[in-house]
Every structure is written in structure tokens, then in C-alpha cells.
């Protein structure tokens, strides 16, 4: 996260680390004890053998020792994502995967599942939310070593795809937060982390997941805000994937 | 909450976790008439509020639960159910003869559980 | 607004050397390819080089490889094309473009993906014959 | 190296016609494939990237089916009168290769 600042234990208890040979290489954010729900490009070719994935969740701090980490069973992506069917192909729409632990993570004050957009329920322009990650806190930087917050406005896709930002390249299942003139956004290492907002529709106040860190321009630059993975729009996909796929392990695809 | 966020159409409550659904042409909530179908009612009412599952759900009596200041009932079309995502699509007012509706704990989600809100 | 705006083109010898400029505005260089494409007279589209200034990573076809040098300068948001040993069939209009780039926000070595050049220059015109 | 072979050279159509351009990779280029307007004296402009992403204006469209690439203008305009580009940008996106062009003129 490019501009925010450290964020203290138990506010974000839905945030995981996705660890591959003990680095951290994606967000994730819980849905449940046992279903992260990330992005798709996490998982490349090259990152395909899941003994060697771990989830790391309940702390702030990336080197704590309070942490729990838990293997992974399957995973499974979306099957409309087409770059793991040509590894050149630049269409990244669906840029969502779920992971399925080897077993649950207990649910305390620090881990804790995020909700998901109410069906129906559209984005607001303008409205602030909040995104988290241990990525890199400059483009060229390294990565946090304490979990970030940064909050940031949702931008209209008619702006976003405006030629002075991304030119039509934000397709309707995608989004854009940040601001006009950059310095706030998610960076490398963010990817597949939570981008979420707050609402009152239940009576209670609950953070729902409205966005997965997907890709970007740079990070932080000047019209060029952070992209991200519309999830009210998978949230069949996400009901479908979870019941199909429970008892399933390894690499996995659902369209 | 502000002017601009209403209420979701289909609510839990946090005291007796029962399901109501708001009817937009009367202005009122009403319960959901209890069915054969209430696992698959509670899973999908759960889902569309943002839940990710049911955990249970069971059966509360009007006479002895209360109407708790909703007004009647709606009555789900079993035969539609298994082909809808919306509960609101499946779902049309009715008398409910037997007086029990639909209560469901949903999976909990979207709250810190610090002991003060940091 | 965006602004691609070519200049150092002209008459020069075979084997002459010439520089041209590509001076730009209204985006972000350093995330951005940049591009020379030129065009010979009555004929169709022929790519030269690109970097990405950001790395500094160049390209070249092969027909101007050990020939042309392609830079950029980030301080001035300026790309050039140093061009040596120039022969006739080099004369052409020389067009700078450039092309946005992105990226995936994991903690992979990053691939870096383009969408097609956006933005293009007026051209300048570069002529070798003796 | 990747090769592109746009036919036809050349065409002649009236206003209001549909025309279509076609463009073949010589290997798997995906999708990266741009198509571009050229007027003479004037610099090329992108129309299409991503083999069939939105045209600007809307008339114009892409398509891909494997290496076969499509630019279709469904009602030609008078000001659409001009030479057509396709161009690969798949290798790493640098080793560009262009198309030989289509001229659309007035019938």
C-alpha cells in the first residue's frame, strides 16, 4: 500500500496472507474458517504446488510469531480468467480465485470472515472504503513488514476509462479506487487482498468485500488508480464455487 | 444511516433471528410463512444479505414469538425456488394459515469482535 | 492533454547520423512505452524501436539493430532516436509514439503488459540521399 | 519473427456499406492485436486494441477467431475513408509487426 499508514490488531481480522515457500506474494480475505477468497493471477503456473502455499492470518506483523498458518487443499479460479489459458492473453477480467484451507482457522478477535455485497447491492461513486495489504509500500519499494490501511474513493468506470486514465481498458466486472491525483494505492504484493466498505443495510454496521487488489498502472501515479475485481458480481460464482468444491484439492476451475 | 443507505430489503434479527422481508408496495415487513423448503429459504436469504451460508435455521410460532411489528406474511413458490438467485423473484404475499414462519442464524461476517473498537 | 512532438529530422547523407527528439506531455513517462515507428514514402507502417523507461529496457527490429539507439530521459520526459550509418532506405516520415502499460499487484517479478499505441506524434521527416 | 497478413490491399465501398478487414498472425499472437486509422499526411490513430476492444466510434469493431483477426466498420462514414492498420504487440510487447494496410476508398 502506497500512502498508508499501520494498522493495529483486529481491525482488518478478515486479511490473510498468501505465502508461497514462506513469501508473501498475494492478499486473501476470509470468508469463512476455511475460504479465502483472492485473485486468480496469484496463482501462475510456476506457483501451482499447493504444499508449498501457506495462510497466514490472526496478526498484523508479517514476522509474528502470534499468527496461525494453515495449508492449503484447493484452489479454485475462475475459469473465465483467460491468462492461465494463453499466458500472453491481456484480458484480465475475472481475476478471482478461492482458496480452500486444509483445515479451519479458529474464529477469535483476530480472525474474523468479511461479509459479501448484498445481491443487488451496487458500488457507490465517491464513496470511501478502505484497502489493506502488506505489499510494497513504493512501486519500486519493498513490502510492508506491518499490515497497511489506506482508504480511498471509488472512482465511476466512465472516468476510469477516460483517456487521460485507462482508455477503456476497465471492463464492467472490474473497478477503480483511488484519487485523481494519486499518492494513496494498492501496490505490488496487494494483489488478491480486500478492498472493503462499510454499510448499514443490516442495521448493524458490517465491511462488506467489494473489491479484490487486481492490477494497476504503476502504483499511486496521477491518474492511473488502483484496478480492481467488481465482487458483486461473483457472488453466484463464489455461493457455486464454495458448494461445489468443498471436498475437492488441488488447482481447480469453475466458470 | 444515512438518508442515502436504505434498509436491505430482507433483514435477521439480532434478538430471535428471524427473517423478514420488506413489502415495498405496502410499506411493511412481513415474515416468510414456513415451508418444506425453509433450508434452501434460510441459505438463499442469508446469501443475499451478504452472508456467505446459513448456519441453521428453525421454526418460530407468531402466537408465541410475536409479530414484533411486522404485518403478515409471504409465502414462497416452491417450484420456482431451486432456479432463482432472489428470494425477492419467488416470493408473494399470503395468510399463512398455520402461523409459523422462517427463523435462520446466518453465518456471521463484517464485525470486529475487539473488546473496544479501535 | 496527451502531446507527442517529434523534431531532428532532415537531410543527411548515407552513412550520416541524425537525432531525433520526442518531447512529451500529458502523462505519466516513465510507465510508459515509448515507441518510433516510421513510414517511407507511399509505403505502409514499419516499427523501429521502444523503451520502457521505467527499466530502461530497449527494443529493436531488426533491420536498424547496431544502428539505432533508442533513450529516453525521464527528467525531461523526452525519448530520442540516435540514428548512425544511415542509408537511402531509411528515409521516412519518423513517428514517436507511446503506450500505456500495466501490471498485476502481486509480489511476482512483474510482467509488463501494453494495450496498443495510444498516442502518436505528427512526424518528422527524415531524408538520406546524397 | 511474427508476420501479419491483412487483405484485402485495397477496396472500394459507398457510404453506409459494412466493411470488413482482415488480418492473419503467422503463429499465436492471443489477443494482442491493435488496428489503427491512417489519413494521408496524417499520423495513425488506435481504433481497436486487444483485438475487440470498444472502437471509438462505435461503428468500428474487432474480433478475433485464433490468429484471424476482424475490423469491421458496420456504416461507413465519409470521414472513414482512409488506410487501415493491423499491428502485434504480443512478444513482450516489442518486435511490433504492422499489417501491409487496407486502403478503403470511395466507390
Known amino acids: 500500500i502506497v500512502g498508508g499508514r499501520d494498522t493495529s490488531l483486529g481491525r482488518w481480522p478478515w486479511q490473510v496472507s498468501l505465502r508461497y515457500d514462506g513469501a508473501h506474494l498475494c492478499g486473501g480475505s476470509l470468508l469463512s474458517g476455511d475460504w479465502v477468497l483472492t485473485a486468480a493471477h496469484c496463482f501462475p503456473e510456476r506457483n501451482r504446488v499447493l504444499s508449498r502455499w501457506r495462510v497466514f492470518a490472526g496478526a498484523v506483523a508479517q514476522a509474528s510469531p502470534h499468527g496461525l498458518q494453515l495449508g492449503v487443499q484447493a484452489v479454485v479460479y475462475h475459469g473465465g480468467y483467460l491468462p492461465f489459458r494463453d499466458p500472453n492473453s491481456e484480458e484480465n477480467s475475472n481475476d478471482i480465485a478461492l482458496v480452500h484451507l486444509s483445515s479451519p482457522l479458529p474464529l477469535t478477535e483476530y480472525i474474523q470472515p468479511v461479509c459479501l455485497p448484498a445481491a443487488g447491492q451496487a458500488l457507490v461513486d465517491g464513496k470511501i472504503c478502505t484497502v489493506t495489504g502488506w505489499g510494497n509500500t513504493q512501486y519500486y519499494g519493498q513490502q510492508a513488514g506491518v499490515l497497511q490501511e489506506a482508504r480511498v474513493p471509488i472512482i465511476s468506470n466512465d472516468v476510469c476509462n477516460g483517456a487521460d486514465f485507462y482508455g477503456n481498458q476497465i471492463k464492467p466486472k472490474m473497478f477503480c479506487a483511488g484519487y485523481p491525483e494519486g499518492g494513496i494505492d494498492a501496490c505490488q504484493g496487494d494483489s488478491g487482498g480486500p478492498f472493503v466498505c462499510e454499510d448499514s443495510i443490516s442495521r448493524t454496521p458490517r465491511w462488506r468485500l467489494c473489491g479484490i487488489v487486481s492490477w494497476g498502472t504503476g502504483c499511486a501515479l496521477a491518474q492511473k488508480p488502483g484496478v480492481y475485481t467488481k465482487v458483486s458480481d461473483f457472488r453466484e460464482w463464489i455461493f457455486q464455487a464454495i458448494k461445489t468444491h468443498s471436498e475437492a484439492s488441488g488447482m481447480v476451475t469453475q466458470l | 444511516r444515512s438518508d442515502q443507505e436504505p434498509l436491505y430489503p430482507v433483514q435477521v434479527s439480532s434478538a430471535d433471528a428471524r427473517l423478514m422481508v420488506f413489502d415495498k408496495t405496502e410499506g411493511t415487513w412481513r415474515l416468510l410463512c414456513s415451508s418444506r423448503s425453509n433450508a434452501r429459504v434460510a441459505g438463499l436469504s442469508c446469501e443475499e444479505m451478504g452472508f456467505l451460508r446459513a448456519l441453521t435455521h428453525s421454526e418460530l410460532d407468531v402466537r408465541t414469538a410475536g409479530a414484533n411489528g411486522t404485518s403478515g406474511f409471504f409465502c414462497v413458490d416452491e417450484g420456482r425456488l431451486p432456479h432463482t438467485q432472489r428470494l425477492l423473484e419467488v416470493i408473494s404475499v399470503c395468510d399463512c394459515p398455520r402461523g409459523r414462519f422462517l427463523a435462520a442464524i446466518c453465518q456471521d461476517c463484517g464485525r470486529r469482535k475487539l473488546p473496544v473498537d479501535r | 492533454e496527451v502531446q507527442l512532438v517529434e523534431s531532428g529530422g532532415g537531410l543527411v547523407q548515407p552513412g550520416g547520423s541524425l537525432r531525433l527528439s520526442c518531447a512529451a506531455s500529458?502523462?505519466?513517462?516513465?510507465?510508459?512505452?515509448m515507441h518510433w515507428v516510421r513510414q517511407a514514402p507511399g509505403k505502409g507502417l514499419e516499427w523501429v524501436a521502444s523503451?520502457?523507461?521505467?527499466?530502461?529496457?530497449?527494443y529493436y527490429a531488426d533491420s536498424v539493430k547496431g544502428r539505432f539507439t533508442i533513450s529516453a530521459d525521464t527528467s525531461k520526459n523526452t525519448a530520442y532516436l540516435q540514428m548512425n550509418s544511415l542509408r537511402a532506405e531509411d528515409t521516412a516520415v519518423y513517428y514517436c509514439?507511446?503506450?500505456?502499460?500495466?501490471?498485476?499487484?502481486?509480489?511476482?517479478?512483474?510482467?509488463?503488459?501494453?494495450?496498443?499505441?495510444?498516442?502518436w506524434g505528427q512526424g518528422t521527416l527524415v531524408t538520406v540521399s546524397s | 519473427d511474427i508476420q501479419m497478413t491483412q487483405s484485402p490491399s485495397s477496396l472500394s465501398a459507398s457510404v453506409g456499406d459494412r466493411v470488413t478487414i482482415t488480418c492473419r498472425a503467422s503463429?499465436?499472437?492471443?489477443?494482442?492485436v491493435a488496428w489503427y486509422q491512417q489519413k494521408p499526411g496524417k499520423a495513425p490513430k488506435l481504433l481497436i486494441y486487444?483485438?475487440?476492444?470498444?472502437g471509438v466510434p462505435s461503428r468500428f469493431s474487432g474480433s478475433r477467431s485464433g490468429t484471424d483477426f476482424t475490423l469491421t466498420i458496420s456504416s461507413l462514414q465519409p470521414e472513414d475513408f482512409a488506410t487501415y492498420y493491423c499491428?502485434?504487440?504480443?512478444?513482450?510487447?516489442?518486435?511490433?509487426?504492422f499489417g501491409q494496410g487496407t486502403k478503403v476508398e470511395i466507390k
Open positions: 509514439a507511446r503506450s500505456d502499460s500495466w501490471s498485476y499487484k502481486s509480489g511476482y517479478t512483474q510482467k509488463i503488459y501494453s494495450k496498443g499505441l495510444d498516442y
Open positions: 500529458g502523462f505519466n513517462f516513465s510507465y510508459s512505452y
Open positions: 523503451i520502457y523507461s521505467y527499466y530502461g529496457s530497449t
Open positions: 503463429q499465436s499472437v492471443s489477443s494482442a
Open positions: 486487444s483485438a475487440s476492444s470498444k
Open positions: 499491428q502485434q504487440y504480443y512478444s513482450s510487447y516489442y518486435l511490433l509487426t
